[in-house]
Amino acid sequence: QEEDLPRPSISAEPGTVIPLGSHVTFVCRGPVGVQTFRLERESRSTYNDTEDVSQASPSESEARFRIDSVSEGNAGPYRCIYYKPPKWSEQSDYLELLVKETSGGPDSPDTEPGSSAGPTQRPSDNSHNEHAPASQGLKAEHLYHHHHHH
């Protein structure tokens, strides 16, 4: 089964420059019909999978990957990939997460404005997806096996 799958997009909320200890959420977006979103680190050997997929708009689905307390080890490039059965998509562009020491100074904002990589169309409807599988959480990081396009 072959389908031309659009590349996913990746963004970060509230931004890509995050104070140490603060939270950040990566948002991966793709077409409707995605079963699994994967957030990859700079190498493809470390990733998180989630099947908690919601419908961001009539033509777009999304998944969110939250880091509650950012550490220096979380800094670096991230990208998304998704599984729309029976095929994996190409990767999104990289999004660089910067982690900064909290200075507490009045002139330094806590975060920079939200940033994204890949297609930048924002969903007009953020309602919960009726198609999302129930009670599927983030998977532990584990080794990635290179996929074969089918």
Epitope: Q1, G33, T50, Y144, H147
Partner: antibody, heavy 110, light 109 residues
Framework: QSVKESGGRLVTPGGSLTLTCTVS????????IQWVRQAPGKGLEWIGF??????GYYASWAKGRFTISKASSTTVELKMTSLTASDTATYFC??????WGPGTLVTISS | ELVLTQTASSVSAAVGGTVTISCQSS???????LSWFQQKPGQPPKELVY???TLQSGVPSRFSGSGSGTQFTLTISDLECDDAATYYC??????????FGGGTEVVVK
């Protein structure tokens, strides 16, 4: 690339059985593996599948009695419990829906 | 409960003719996730059509799928003797659940 089921046999009512789906030529990390059954002379019935992430999804009637899991990098198992005569069928596994095994026959009888 | 109904349990037509098999779902399939399978006795099913209307590789263009929402059809034109088989529809639903239709036997005269 192939899939093949094994483990089908005669089981007495109330018993349990584990079927194995062995794949070759592709990675379980990249595909759903579906389980389907077909009673003699009847239609196809979806049981459930395991996703690349390792999550199991089941038909409502199969929840509780049927469990799908990855046993190794090349095998997926279907564990069935509290078997009755109505579970007598040929059991198929499939890579998503495009590549099927020949099936394995499970007979529940005393 | 998810129910896929194939209204005709059997249809027949002469060689060179056309048959249409219908499949009705009790609820909308997700993202046009509707497939058609062909099964011959003693063999596993073979996927012919997926995503409602896309032909699987190697399937002749005599087969075509159409429909949306809850109503779908498989049309086989220029019937050949080799098309004699049972055909099943399969729907994919919210939350990644699937259901098969009851099957329609195609008899080629």
């Amino acid at each position: 690339q192939s899939v093949k089921e094994s483990g089908g046999r005669l089981v007495t009512p109330g018993g349990s059985l584990t079927l194995t789906c062995t794949v070759s030529g592709f990675s379980l990390s990249n595909y759903n593996i579906q389980w389907v059954r077909q009673a003699p002379g009847k239609g196809l019935e979806w049981i459930g599948f395991i996703s690349p992430a390792g999550n199991g999804y089941y038909a409502s009637w199969a929840k509780g009695r049927f469990t799908i899991s990855k046993a190794s990098s090349t095998t997926v198992e279907l564990k069935m419990t509290s078997l009755t005569a109505s579970d007598t069928a040929t059991y198929f596994c499939a890579r998503h829906w495009d590549l099927w095994g020949p099936g394995t026959l499970v007979t529940i009888s005393s | 409960e998810l129910v896929l109904t194939q209204t005709a349990s059997s249809v027949s037509a002469a060689v060179g003719g056309t048959v249409t098999i219908s499949c009705q779902s009790s609820q909308s399939v997700y993202s046009n996730y509707l497939s058609w399978f062909q099964q011959k006795p003693g063999q596993p099913p073979k996927e012919l059509v997926y995503w409602t209307s896309t032909l699987q590789s190697g399937v002749p263009s005599r087969f075509s799928g159409s429909g949306s929402g809850t109503q779908f059809t498989l049309t086989i034109s220029d019937l050949e003797c080799d098309d004699a088989a049972t055909y099943y529809c399969l729907g994919g639903y919210s939350g990644w659940f699937y259901a098969f239709g009851g099957g329609t036997e195609v008899v080629v005269k």
